[in-house]
Interface confidence: low
């Protein structure tokens, strides 16, 4: 019968011919009367056999990630008779792994959005690297994740690649962060290969800023000929938040004369001062009103940021019109 051990050949061997093992018949007494032949994919090109001894050699550099095993057939023939000594047999040559592939992040680019002021431990995103080496071969494909850039705001779980918040962030100070994650194989041991990826983390806005008037005093004028409903001027507050969180409502806080109103232009986020009652220069030539501004939408949990609405004082001068 046939005699052989399991055949292994390391990938990426640089030698011109690498001895893999021997394939022989137990009828072979070593007097060179038998001839060994190799058949199948790779025979003659990748692998050769010594016809007299049955020694098998790899004559090409192999890449396990391209092909991890070869199935070949062996024949042994009695040279004198030309007849097969053993039935043709199939055998396997396995290509054994070396750590020649670095981890790769296949789902790049990574981008995540997380609300500003999120607490520590908040999940941001999970990054995953893959390694083409053999996961069953030692630690060649066992990965560990680490953070190269992003401290102190972010952390990464070493075995899962889960990125979490490690420090609260304020969108109004910085609205996006670039985090760089490294994946290292060989669980970080010597000879490890690594790959990196960048993650763009954007902070979404929460309503943590109240609108504040740009000026503590506004001066407007109104003609005594102006009809009721006339827009006599605008006041403006600013809000460091964005979008819906920056939408504001203006209102009168104090107007003893009941002469003016303020409506909100939600398009420009301005407060428009409206004449509610006609004015008469001879009757009163100036008015003082106090206005306030508040955000349109404030969730209950963010009310702590919105105590005491911002106010402003508006001096309104009446312009005289010559009467006939």
């Amino acid at each position: 019968g046939w005699v052989w051990n399991q055949f292994f050949v390391p990938e990426e061997m640089n030698t011109t011919s690498h001895h893999i093992g021997q394939l022989r018949s137990d009828l072979d007494n070593g007097n060179n009367s038998f001839q060994y032949k190799l058949l199948g994919a790779g025979a003659g090109s990748t692998f050769i056999i010594d016809e007299r001894t049955g020694d098998i050699y790899a004559i090409q550099k192999l890449d396990r990630e391209e092909r991890s095993l070869y199935i070949l057939r062996a024949q042994v023939i009695d040279i004198a008779t030309g007849r097969a000594v053993e039935p043709e047999s199939e055998f396997v040559i396995k290509v054994s792994d070396i750590n020649d592939n670095e981890p790769k992040f296949l789902d790049e680019p990574y981008e995540a959005i997380v609300p500003e002021m999120s607490p520590e431990g908040t999940l941001v995103i999970q990054v995953t690297a893959s390694d083409a080496d053999d996961p069953s071969s030692g630690n060649n494909a066992r990965l560990l994740y680490s953070l190269l850039q992003g401290q102190p705001y972010f952390s990464v779980e070493p075995t899962t690649g889960v990125i979490r918040i490690s420090s609260k962030m304020d969108r109004e100070l910085q609205d996006e962060y670039w985090v760089i994650i490294q994946a290292k194989d060989m669980i970080g041991q010597p000879g490890a290969l690594s790959g990196t990826t960048s993650v763009l983390i954007k902070l979404s806005d929460v309503n943590d800023n109240k609108p504040i008037f740009k000026e503590s005093l506004y001066r407007l004028t109104v003609s005594e000929s102006a009809p009721t409903g006339t827009s006599i001027g605008t006041i403006m507050a600013y809000d460091n938040d964005i979008g819906e969180n920056a939408e504001m409502d203006y209102s009168i806080e104090e107007d003893d004369s009941q002469t003016f109103d303020i409506i909100t232009n939600h398009e420009t986020q301005e407060g428009i001062v409206i004449l509610k009652k006609k004015v008469d220069f001879e009757h009163q030539n100036h008015y003082g009103i106090r206005a306030k501004v508040k955000n349109h939408h404030v969730p209950e949990q963010l009310m702590k940021y919105h105590t005491e609405a911002s106010t402003t004082f508006i001096k309104i001068q009446v312009e005289d019109v010559d009467e006939p």
Epitope: L220, T221, I232, G233, T234, M236, E267, T268, Q269, E270
Partner: antibody
């Protein structure tokens, strides 16, 4: 950066129609009122029409009222001017312009597109 | 509508000189809602001044605006070669109207 690019101009016969487009980029289109302004060859600027940020309000110069229609498509970040019953006096370079957020002046303008109404 | 009249029609000056452009409104422009634009040949207008006196982003401080009510002024303190252009005033107190323009040319 903010960019406004007009297109759709050309030579057209009196009484015919033309639609101008203005592709906006580099800003939140849906937050701004947008305008069309024209300039006849060798002449000054003439305001034509405005549309509010949400498309609910339009306002026209008397010279084009009833013939021109301003519209916008927020999903395409594009402003339009549909010009019907064109006259020789409508010949001009047409600019789209963005209205300042906290003001009513025009902070960004396109490069313009020429409309020639001629038989 | 508010009619804006600019003067002079043409201003012939040399680089380094001071330019003073006037814009008069047919009625009072409330809240100084007046802007100034520069238009170079073959180009679109560019916002210089809004609110009568506020410089737009990126505009050099040699440009200044002043005035209120019906009389407004654009001043260029020292003309640079690139300042020779047509200047328009615009009111946006009541709809939008432009002046007829003032051409600043090299003498």
């Amino acid at each position: 950066q903010v960019q406004l690019v007009e297109s759709g101009g050309g030579v057209v016969q009196p009484g015919r129609s033309l639609r101008l487009s203005c592709a906006a980029s580099g800003f939140t289109f849906s937050s701004y009122d947008m305008h069309w302004v024209r300039q006849a060859p060798g002449k000054g600027l003439e305001w034509v029409a405005v549309i509010s940020y949400d498309g609910t309000n339009e306002y026209y110069a008397d010279s084009v009222k009833g013939r021109f229609t301003i519209s916008r498509d927020t999903s395409k970040n594009t402003l339009y001017l549909q010009m019907n019953s064109l006259r020789a006096e409508d010949t001009a370079v047409y600019y789209c312009a963005r209205e300042r957020y906290f003001d009513w002046s025009f902070d960004y303008w396109g490069q313009g597109t020429l409309v020639s109404v001629s038989s | 509508e508010i009619v804006l009249t600019q003067s002079p029609g043409t201003l012939s000056l040399s680089p380094g000189e001071r330019a003073t452009l006037s814009c008069r409104a047919s009625q009072s422009v409330s809240n100084t809602y007046l802007a100034w634009y520069q238009q170079r040949p073959g180009q679109a207008p560019r916002l210089l001044i809004y609110g009568a006196s506020s410089r737009a982003t990126g505009i050099p401080d040699r440009f200044s605006g002043s005035g209120s009510g019906t009389d407004f002024t654009l001043t260029i303190s020292s003309l640079e070669p690139e300042d020779f252009a047509v200047y328009y005033c615009q009111q946006y107190s009541n709809s939008w109207t432009f002046g007829q323009g003032t051409k600043v040319e090299i003498k």
